[in-house]
């Protein structure tokens, strides 16, 4: 049987990807990170 029409079963969340560089002073240079939805993931 063919499927009846329904939307995908999951919701797509559109989030900003923010790259940032943070100066850590005289230690090891800078930390480069990727923030997704407010959480640093890399």
């Amino acid at each position: 049987d063919a499927e009846f029409r329904h939307d995908s079963g999951y919701e797509v969340h559109h989030q900003k990807l923010v790259f940032f560089a943070e100066d850590v002073g005289s230690n090891k240079g800078a930390i480069i990170g990727l923030m997704v939805g407010g959480v640093v993931i890399a």
Partner: antibody, heavy 123, light 112 residues
Amino acid sequence: QVTLKESGPALVKPTQTLTLTCTFSGFSLSTSGMGVGWIRQPPGKALEWLAHIWWDDDKSYNPSLKSRLTISKDTSKNQVVLTMTNMDPVDTATYYCARRQLGLRSIDAMDYWGQGTTVTVSS
Amino acid sequence: DVVMTQSPLSLPVTPGEPASISCRSSQSILHSNGNTYLEWYLQKPGQSPQLLIYKVSNRFSGVPDRFSGSGSGTDFTLKISRVEAEDVGVYYCVQTSLVPLTFGQGTKLEIK
């Protein structure tokens, strides 16, 4: 508020074509995800799904009746029309229209129904 | 076509007592999007069907919390925790995952 109302002939003769109109208010068939379908119920029997039409004019039919059914919409009039050809006494039933809306924030079920219109097929 | 089989077909219940209706599908009604589109409708005497439960277990707005739906795969259940006089009518399950959409035969709930 959302309302739907079916209209059409109360009596049709065998072999004739039935034309039913569902006139609705409180929503628009131009809204993304919106759809209206037809369901019938012979006297004292269970419900049977007939057809459905979506806002983008996509249509779905019951395969067992597909050759006899045509569903269409007039968005400007807030109407959905169902035609059924070659009517037979076994098609005697109450015919309902109902709305259904796709979408992750929608119910995606037949949440509002019309009152139904009774059609008798007899010579 | 998917055959929906309800039991019992007749259900006499004493007010205040619980009631349970079974609905079985002849094949899986799991949609490719991961949802199971199993709905319950109540048709009160002389009225149009009205939505009670959608996607197996979600109560429609305004439906009393004494109504609950459960199940998966091919086996589904509608439960009424405490039956009231206004609950009389015919209950239908319907699968809307596959074409054609198919209804059960209906279960007539009556008050003892």
